[in-house]
């Protein structure tokens, strides 16, 4: 014989239940009928991007919901969140019925990622959450590409790169000039300034600044963006000895990067060429 619905049995025993249950007890009337898989709404022909889950009654396969998608309710909101997500929000109770195009019992809400911290993917990309990494991995696999795995918690480490390099400067002796350099990297790079000295036969050596120069100041600050550092070399007053090539050098555990600019010292302003190199400053 086909099982009667549990709801009917509960109603039949309502009097007895009222006697047995304490008044404070709240019992949901959500029930599951027999499972009838062929009556379940069919899954998309190309399958589920975020994998499959089952309805509240464990009968019907359904596509797992992604971040920000509705979950737990009836009708269009019916559904369970993909692994690593949870269904949160408005608690609206509804009666449930499964196995016949029905939404299972539950609340209506949206799927949010359980872990809301950034993670580093095996593709070298930083994802805002593990859920977004999983979604990207599913998309990659659906395109026939390699799955993306989580390499580490937090942002991906990356070698430094120069965001804004220093610019060449022409100025007269006695002037106050500065070079600036903006770099980025994860972990945040260490920025230093060197003066490049070219010896005989093109041999290059560097002198770490500021050294003992009393007219030269180095300043470094974090930013303007996360994992960025900006540094300045301030020369005041400018002398002939300050002419030369200045290198901004950034390094972290993942590598190093550098960029350089020249300071040219002239006796008078009219000696500064009208057509200066691109990016040159007074």
């Amino acid at each position: 014989m086909e099982r009667p619905s549990l709801r009917a049995l509960l109603l039949g025993a309502a009097g007895l239940l009222l006697l047995l249950l304490p008044l404070s007890s709240s019992s949901s009337s959500d029930t599951c009928g027999p499972c009838e898989p062929a009556s379940c709404p069919p899954l998309p022909p190309l399958g589920c991007l975020l994998g499959e889950t089952r309805d509240a009654c464990g009968c019907c396969p359904m596509c797992a919901r992604g971040e920000g998608e509705p979950c737990g309710g009836g009708g269009a909101g019916r559904g369970y969140c993909a692994p690593g997500m949870e269904c949160v929000k408005s608690r609206k109770r509804r009666k449930g019925k499964a196995g016949a195009a029905a939404g299972g019992p539950g609340v209506s809400g949206v799927c949010v990622c359980k872990s809301r911290y950034p993670v580093c993917g095996s593709d070298g990309t930083t994802y805002p959450s593990g859920c977004q990494l999983r979604a990207a991995s599913q998309r990659a696999e659906s395109r026939g590409e390699k799955a993306i795995t989580q390499v580490s918690k937090g942002t991906c480490e990356q070698g430094p790169s120069i965001v804004t390099p220093p610019k060449d400067i022409w100025n007269v002796t006695g002037a106050q000039v500065y070079l600036s350099c903006e770099v980025i990297g994860i972990p945040t790079p260490v920025l230093i300034w060197n003066k490049v000295k070219r010896g005989h036969y093109g041999v290059q050596r560097t002198e770490l600044l500021p050294g003992d120069r009393d007219n030269l100041a180095i300043q470094t600050r974090g930013g303007p963006e996360k994992h960025e550092v900006t540094g300045w070399v301030l020369v005041s007053p400018l002398s002939k000895e300050d002419a030369g090539e200045y290198e901004c050098h950034a390094s972290n555990s993942q590598g190093q990067a550098s960029a350089s600019a020249k300071i040219t010292v002239v006796d008078a302003l009219h000696e500064i060429p009208v057509k200066k190199g691109e990016g040159a400053e007074l």
Epitope: E2, S5, R7, A8, G33, P34, C35, E36, P37, A38, S39, C40, P41, P42, G58, C59, G74, G75, K95, K97, G99, A100, A101, A102, G103
Partner: antibody
Framework: QIQLVQSGPELKKPGETVKISCKAS????????IHWVKQAPGKGLKWMGL????????IYVDDFKGRFAFSLETSARTAYLQINNLKNEDTATYFC????????WGQGTLV | DVVMTQTPLTLSVTIGQPASISCKSS???????????LHWLLQRPGQSPKRLIY???KLDSGVPDRFTGSGSRTDFTLKISRVEAEDLGVYYC?????????FGGGTKLE
């Protein structure tokens, strides 16, 4: 006892619309989906789809998408099958049946 | 869609003799919950179908125990130990494991 009673036979012309009813009694109407099954003269049974009596959500088999519509009048404990723009090949007996596992059937409506 | 193939198409039997109908599915009907959704229906002339057996072998109430259902995965059988006059009609197997529900072509018992 549990019963599904369908509306009487219908004689229609191609291009017309027909609406068949299936009235349920003897059980809680919204607890069980209603299925629709087509049987052409001298042929076998073909499932058309179902309607979830709790949510009103229909599911149609591919062959019955477009001109066919399932609906409900819950207060009257009645499910409906409407066929628009009738074609000769729609000539058949249409059965409603209650979930689950084909336990209860209507007597059929010949169109 | 899952194709349900019934044999024979027609079965001529003498009253009191046994009868056997085979139903084969193009895919396994074993669902992930361990249940197999295969049912048998009888449609007598001019009537609506009536369920005899559900979930392979469970006999409906009011159905005589001369009917037995058996089988698993893709091969199923309905047996009648001693055919009676009221058993005449068309027998259908139906699967409820895979969307959409599908029926066998029918076996006419005469």
């Amino acid at each position: 006892q549990i019963q599904l009673v369908q509306s009487g036979p219908e004689l229609k012309k191609p291009g017309e619309t027909v609406k068949i009813s299936c009235k349920a009694s003897g059980y809680s109407f919204t607890d069980y989906s209603i299925h629709w099954v087509k049987q052409a003269p001298g042929k076998g049974l073909k499932w058309m789809g179902l309607i979830n009596t709790e949510t009103g959500e229909p599911i149609y088999v591919d062959d019955f998408k477009g001109r066919f519509a399932f609906s409900l009048e819950t207060s009257a404990r009645t499910a409906y099958l409407q066929i628009n723009n009738l074609k000769n090949e729609d000539t058949a007996t249409y059965f409603c049946a209650r979930a689950y596992y084909w336990a209860y059937w209507g007597q059929g409506t010949l169109v | 869609d899952v194709v349900m193939t019934q044999t024979p198409l027609t079965l001529s039997v003498t009253i009191g003799q046994p009868a056997s109908i085979s139903c084969k599915s193009s895919q396994s009907l074993l669902y992930s919950n361990g249940e197999t959704y295969l049912h048998w229906l009888l449609q007598r002339p001019g009537q609506s179908p009536k369920r005899l057996i559900y979930l392979v072998s469970k006999l409906d109430s009011g159905v005589p125990d001369r009917f037995t259902g058996s089988g698993s995965r893709t091969d199923f059988t309905l047996k009648i130990s001693r055919v009676e006059a009221e058993d005449l009609g068309v027998y259908y197997c139906a699967q409820g494991t895979h969307f959409p529900h599908t029926f066998g072509g029918g076996t006419k018992l005469e």
